[in-house]
């Protein structure tokens, strides 16, 4: 006999990176017929929702009107059908951004390079932080973590045209509190590649969707969160 129900999906709309004082909605999708959903924050019960009518609803939303550092952290949800509870969802890392300062992002040797040249990004923030994150715009995206007292290096190695794009970085004060984003740096990679072995080893993280972060409260742009399965958030762990 089945002891638990399948775990629900959890995600944040419009994005798991939330500028401070902005709104965010945590969504939990379980099954039709669920009579109760519980949202847990850092291991403790945070909120409860009982959908009506349960047989016509398979998703609930927990609204946070004013994001701040106290609300940033790890969320999970569970649901109940009758007396049977589900497995807990994956953990959702909700990050507050636009905290304190703005880092500076630069790239060496420059923003325009030839395919095959070695490229290194530098993210600098003079206030006290030791962790930095480099993000590339778009659905197919690199997310890298770097460390340093005031500056982190992000060596991309020999680049290909797959590395073309717009990059930004954050300083991270802890796993769930990030700085303002840096100004964007657009990397242009020119030249035809003859050596296909130069393709990046790990060219994509399907999670980044930086574009949705930029459009947080202006458009309420949505994406199919169930597809990306929290890859970027795994970076935080």
């Amino acid at each position: 006999q089945q002891q638990t129900l399948p775990k629900p999906f959890i995600w944040a709309e419009p994005h798991f990176m939330v500028p401070k004082e902005k709104q965010v909605t945590i969504c939990c999708q379980g099954n039709y017929g669920a009579v109760e959903y519980q949202l847990h924050f850092e291991g403790s019960l945070f909120a409860v929702d009982r959908p009506k009518p349960p047989e016509r609803i398979n998703k609930v939303q927990f609204y946070i009107p004013d994001m701040n550092s106290r609300m940033a952290g790890q969320y999970s949800c569970i649901y109940r059908v009758g007396e049977l509870w589900s497995e807990p969802s994956n953990l959702l890392d909700l990050v507050v951004t636009e905290m304190y300062d703005t880092p500076t992002l630069s790239v060496h040797p420059g923003p325009e390079v030839i395919s095959g040249e070695k490229v290194t990004f530098y993210c600098r923030l003079d206030t006290a932080t030791s962790m930095f994150l480099l993000l590339k715009e778009g659905r197919s995206s690199h997310v890298q973590r770097g460390y340093g007292k005031v500056q982190a290096e992000f060596p991309l190695g020999p680049v290909t045209t797959a590395h073309r794009g717009t990059y930004r970085c954050f300083g991270s004060y802890n796993n769930h509190a990030w700085s303002f984003p840096s100004e964007p740096v657009k990397l242009l990679v020119t030249g035809d590649i003859e050596n296909t072995s130069l393709a990046p080893e790990d060219p994509t993280f399907p999670a980044d969707t930086w574009g949705t972060y930029l459009l947080t409260t202006e458009t309420g742009l949505q994406k199919d969160h169930a597809l990306w399965d929290h890859t970027a958030q795994n970076l935080l762990r």
Epitope: S106, P109, E112, G116, E117, K118, T160
Partner: antibody, heavy 118, light 107 residues
Amino acid sequence: EVQLQQSGAEVKKPGSSVKVSCKTSGYTFTEYSMHWVRQAPGKSLEWFGGISPNSGGTSYNQKFKGRATLTVDKSSSTAYMELSSLRSEDTAVYYCARRDFHSSFDYWGQGTTVTVSS
Amino acid sequence: DIVMTQSPATLSLSPGERATLSCRASQSISDYLHWFQQKPHESPRLLIKYASQSISGIPARFSGSGSGSDFTLTISSLEPEDFAVYYCQNGHSFPLTFGPGTKVDIK
């Protein structure tokens, strides 16, 4: 010690081609892109183009595109610059220069004088 | 293309004097600006990278400043071997472009 040794001076007729070589030593050839810069008599420096020996990827100054060809021979750690359909305005000293990935052109060849004259 | 301009075209100074050379880009290039020195019948030599960063082996009297589109190379006290032509270079985007040069000669 990093060295870039260029081939000797050339005198060419208008309409012909010239190929200048740049033999490198003292570093890993494939790790740095090689660029070519020319300098007409009494004039400033003009970037010609660059090539990554690692990939064979190239970037050319559009002013020379179609007439210029940059190549490398990895086995001999040598870069080549070929310019076709020469005209008198191409008379210049041609330099090869290594582009460091943490700065700019950090090592230069001694220069090759190309004279185009009928 | 990014056009680099330099001023003055010629700077006549005596040894021991301070030299201030200017370079302007036709659009913002952040700090992707490099300075080169060239003496007659010699290849150029990299002096300053990324507007203000020093290069190993280059005397400390050479310094750079600026960001965006306006840059300065300063030679704090001219030595006899510093009389040469100085070029700034756009390292931001292709085509990589050089300024017309500033000639520093002996007064």
